[in-house]
């Protein structure tokens, strides 16, 4: 179990079986019925309670520090309560399941699903060790999903799963500078399924973005826009129902 690894080890990759350097273990916990690892009810995210239940506490099925569930993660749409108990990451670097704008309307009041397209403000830009988490469900017969890390009118990182490009499923990553798209980076591993829930996590590293989907490392994308502190917004669009979009430091 990853609980034996220190946060430092998890981040540096030293002495752990997780070479991508993600915090904690990824996808090695037996799944609940129909769910992701550690799910507490069918189709749920790790450690997620039914909507609206258990505000601010870890719901049944989410033990502290469970792989795939950040410590004491609240159900999406509720404000987080105190951190979970022993077994969670050290409090100095403890990820919360929600950072800014957790499943809220534009003024910070608790709300239901977010309206897509949705913009997550990043007023201080992005910095290394920042973890952005997006929870949602792919719509049936989906065509595309897009995440756009925006620097003014530029797109520093465009993450674009395409469900049917010439009868193939592919993820395209790119950067747009001065209205011009650069060289595409394509990834054929495609972890999204129409009609199914997903969790996308983007970890900002000094020289690249790391992306994991459903607790499995997917890809990394080297920074083409170097001024990370100027990446001030994350645009989320496409054929999804969006549950929450949030960030924290790890």
């Amino acid at each position: 179990m990853a609980d034996n690894f220190s946060l430092h080890d998890a981040l540096s990759g030293s002495g752990n079986p997780n070479p991508q350097g993600w915090p904690g273990a990824w996808g090695n916990q037996p799944a609940g019925a129909g769910g992701y690892p550690g799910a507490s009810y069918p189709g749920a995210y790790p450690g997620q309670a039914p909507p609206g239940a258990y505000p601010g506490q870890a719901p049944p099925g989410a033990y502290p520090g469970a792989p795939g569930a950040y410590p004491g993660a609240p159900a999406p749409g509720v404000y987080p309560g105190p951190p979970s108990g022993p077994g969670a990451y050290p409090s100095s670097g403890q990820p919360s399941a929600t950072g800014a704008y957790p499943a809220t309307g534009p003024y910070g009041a608790p709300a239901g699903p977010l309206i897509v397209p949705y913009n997550l403000p990043l007023p201080g830009g992005v910095v290394p060790r920042m973890l952005i988490t997006i929870l949602g469900t792919v719509k049936p017969n989906a065509n595309r999903i897009a995440l756009d890390f925006q620097r003014g009118n530029d797109v520093a990182f465009h993450f674009n799963p395409r469900f049917n490009e010439n009868n193939r499923r592919v993820i395209v990553c790119n950067t747009k500078l001065d209205n011009n798209w650069g060289r595409e980076e394509r990834q054929s591993v495609f972890p999204f399924e129409s009609g199914k829930p997903f969790k996308i996590q983007v970890l900002v590293e000094p020289d690249h973005f790391k992306v994991a989907v459903n607790d499995a490392h997917l890809l990394q994308y080297n920074h083409r826009v170097k001024k990370l502190n100027e990446i001030s917004k994350l645009g989320i669009s496409g054929d999804i129902d969006l549950t929450s979009a949030s960030y924290t430091m790890i």
């Epitope: 950072g99 800014a100 534009p106 007023p123 830009g125 003014g152």
Partner: antibody
Framework: QVQLQQSGPQLVRPGASVKISCKAS????????MHWVKQRPGQGLEWIGM????????RLNQKFKDKATLTVDKSSSTAYMQLSSPTSEDSIVYYC???????WGQGTTLTVSS | DIAMTQSHKFMSTSVGDRVSITCKAS??????VAWYQQKPGQSPKLLIY???TRHTGVPDRFTGSGSGTDYTLTISSVQAEDLALYYC?????????FGGGTKLEIK
């Protein structure tokens, strides 16, 4: 270096709207949110809202939704806050601040008086 | 809204002393906390963000710490120029909210 130059002190009659400006220089104006914060003399700070100059998306504190309107002029790298129907309660200092916010303007003192 | 409480409105100290200013959030703000210094007649200056990251040009006698709901700004050796008002702010969720401020005074 980063500079946020706010408009000077303003005297306004109750009920007449007023617009405060904040001219930015020394950084990429469209790459950072611009915040507005109010402060009563000898009292604490209160966040009014913020605007993304690249597309004018705003996030307002619900408390100020009928009071403040945030706009920008990209061509002059200037942010504006318009206050509607000011009362004596609005006689305070208003700051603009960029980004985190990490740099602040010098403040604009508003006096509402008949 | 998230309330940020600075329990000490005033703190007395002497030059050279170590002082800690505390701030408590009404809910877990996941280290999304900044600290500002404001001197009379001046605008606030950012000292610390993300609870512990020092802003450019801030002397290393200023350090921030904390997690969950409890955050602290520590000045390891107070200088005369540090006498000011100090505010914490959460940037976890809108509306961003500030603490009421702590005024650092000389004994």
């Amino acid at each position: 270096q980063v500079q946020l130059q706010q408009s000077g002190p303003q005297l306004v009659r109750p009920g007449a709207s007023v617009k405060i400006s904040c001219k930015a220089s020394g950084y990429s104006f469209t790459s950072y949110w611009m915040h507005w914060v109010k402060q009563r003399p000898g009292q604490g700070l209160e966040w009014i809202g913020m605007i993304d100059p690249s597309d004018s998306e705003t996030r307002l504190n619900q408390k100020f939704k009928d009071k403040a309107t945030l706009t920008v002029d990209k061509s002059s790298s200037t942010a504006y806050m318009q206050l509607s129907s000011p009362t004596s309660e609005d006689s305070i200092v208003y700051y603009c601040a960029k980004g985190r916010p990490d740099y602040w303007g010098q403040g604009t003192t508003l006096t509402v008086s008949s | 809204d998230i309330a940020m409480t600075q329990s000490h409105k005033f703190m007395s100290t002497s030059v050279g002393d170590r002082v800690s200013i505390t701030c408590k959030a009404s809910q877990d703000v996941s280290t999304a906390v900044a600290w500002y210094q404001q001197k009379p007649g001046q605008s606030p200056k950012l000292l610390i963000y993300w609870a512990s990251t020092r802003h450019t040009g801030v002397p290393d006698r200023f350090t921030g710490s904390g997690s969950g709901t409890d955050y602290t700004l520590t000045i390891s050796s107070v200088q005369a120029e540090d006498l000011a008002l100090y505010y914490c702010q959460q940037h976890y969720n809108t509306p961003y909210t500030f603490g009421g401020g702590t005024k650092l005074e000389i004994k």
